[in-house]
């Protein structure tokens, strides 16, 4: 097909030879094609213009990517010729850096439904070069970690050596979606949640006397959980006495919250104190009853077939422990009156 009518965008990928990094190209079809096409349900039927130039299908992967060989040969289908480049919906992922990725990439709808659709395409001229600026030794990594529950920030690797004052306006994307409020070279996160994880893209424009380029970098952001600094806490029993009926069966539950540890060896057990004697009780297995990314609530019950007079003189102690320390909670049984 004739690509002379395609809109053109120039991009620069400066990669670090020290680190593994990825790169992405978005199929930036002119609006409203893009919204109709790559982001399903952005336009409600009422919002669709009467004469939409391009009416593709709603299939999110319904764009075709090509590379234009530099020798003038016909366009090549990306999927057939380039195993290190993968298409995900409207995005092209480059899994390995290298100057051999330089070239022209064209995306257009798979389905051509009207004469208007022929020109519904984007040509991206990608220049790839290794980073030569040795003065910026501590540029931000293309893999950045955020600690769950704390404050953090995501830095644009290609701008991390510049101060906020001299930094150009930056366009940020997260998982292919525009983050319209972010314009600086750093995204500040007040409190890190698990959903902050993802693939972030930062773009800024660099111009010379001849032309302007979009400089792009991709950051893989992971949320991480630090090992707990706390010993486990016992949530139940809360009271240290428990009213019971003699001769009746009784179950006492011990529930404890354990914080995450990479080496996780929680201990939860019951033992009985009777005057100077102390012994551990064989009780049913402990079971995890609630889970989050940062902690685990584990329960273990002690079961008495029937409460005796002797049990009223004993203390039932729940003992919990992790690598930081231990906690106990004792329960004294008291006969219910009336």
């Amino acid at each position: 097909f004739n690509i002379s009518g395609c809109s053109t965008k120039k991009l620069l990928w400066t990669y670090s030879t020290r680190s593994e990094e990825e790169f992405v190209l978005f199929c930036d079809l002119p609006e409203p094609q893009k919204s109709h096409f790559c982001h399903r349900n952005r336009l409600s039927p009422k919002q669709v213009p009467e004469h939409l130039p391009f009416m593709g299908s709603n299939d999110l992967s319904d764009v075709q990517w090509y590379q234009q060989p530099s020798n003038g040969d016909p366009l090549e289908d990306i999927r057939k010729s380039y195993p290190h480049i993968i298409q995900d919906k409207c995005t092209l992922h480059f899994l390995t850096p290298g100057v051999n990725n330089s070239g022209s990439y064209i995306c257009r709808p798979k389905m051509i439904k009207s004469p208007y659709d022929v020109a519904c395409c984007v040509k991206m001229i990608l220049e790839v070069k290794p980073q030569t600026n040795a003065s910026c030794e501590y540029s931000a990594s293309h893999k950045q970690d955020l600690l769950l529950g704390s404050t953090g920030s995501i830095s644009c690797p290609s701008l991390s050596c510049q101060s906020d004052a001299q930094s150009p306006a930056v366009t940020w994307y997260k998982n292919g979606k525009l983050l319209s409020v972010e314009r600086s070279n750093r995204i500040v996160v007040d409190e890190v949640y698990d959903y902050h994880q993802g693939t972030y893209v930062c773009d800024y424009t660099q111009s010379d006397t001849v032309s302007s380029w979009t400089v792009r970098a991709v950051v893989q952001v992971r949320t991480i959980v630090g090992d707990t600094k706390l010993k486990p806490d016992i949530l139940d029993p809360v009271e240290d006495t428990l009213e019971v009926e003699l001769g009746k069966p009784l179950t006492i539950s011990c529930k404890a919250r354990f914080g995450f540890e990479r080496v996780f060896n929680p201990v939860i057990k019951w033992y009985i104190k009777d005057s100077d004697l102390e012994w551990e009780v064989s009780v049913p297995e402990a079971k995890s009853i609630k889970s989050t990314l940062k902690d685990e609530i584990i329960e273990r019950n002690i079961i008495l077939e029937k409460v005796t007079q002797r049990d009223l003189r004993r203390k039932f102690v729940c003992f919990v422990q992790n690598s930081i320390g231990n906690t106990t909670q004792s329960v004294q049984l008291k006969e219910k009156r009336g």
Epitope: D194, R222, V225, F260, S291, L293, K294, D295, E296
Partner: nanobody, 123 residues
Framework: DVQLQESGGGLVQPGGSLRLSCAAS????????MGWYRQTPGKQRELVAA???????TYQDSVKGRFTISRDNANRTANLYMNSLKSEDTAVYYC?????????????????WGQGTQVTVSS
């Protein structure tokens, strides 16, 4: 690793009821949504009902008013209450859970399936 265990399938007469239960087990994980899907021979798996961690639900049109999905407070179990069962409800029912887990300190996504439980509606 997070795993799912389904129970409650079986043979039931038209108009009867069944309760399917799906329990997630593992350490340091959160579930965003749990759902029940069904599949009949030669057909694709289809969503029957789903419930998110905040309790919002979605149902396939053909089961609305007959099936109810619920979850426990700890978000580890999803139950599907099936009433007024019809022969076309006969299928293998699969539980699905979507969430995140803590893999040695790194938060990772998961989307897992149970092994499936057979529901047969027949007189």
């Amino acid at each position: 690793d997070v795993q799912l265990q389904e129970s409650g399938g079986g043979l039931v007469q038209p108009g009867g009821s069944l309760r399917l239960s799906c329990a997630a087990s593992g350490r340091f994980f959160t579930i965003n949504a749990m759902g029940w899907y069904r599949q009949t021979p030669g057909k694709q798996r289809e969503l029957v009902a789903a419930i998110t961690s905040d309790g919002s639900t979605t149902y396939q049109d053909s089961v609305k008013g007959r099936f109810t999905i619920s979850r426990d407070n700890a978000n580890r179990t999803a139950n599907l209450y099936m009433n007024s069962l019809k022969s076309e409800d006969t299928a293998v029912y699969y539980c699905n859970a979507d969430g995140r887990f803590n893999d040695n300190g790194y938060v990772k996504n998961f989307n897992i399936w149970g092994q499936g439980t057979q529901v047969t509606v027949s007189s």
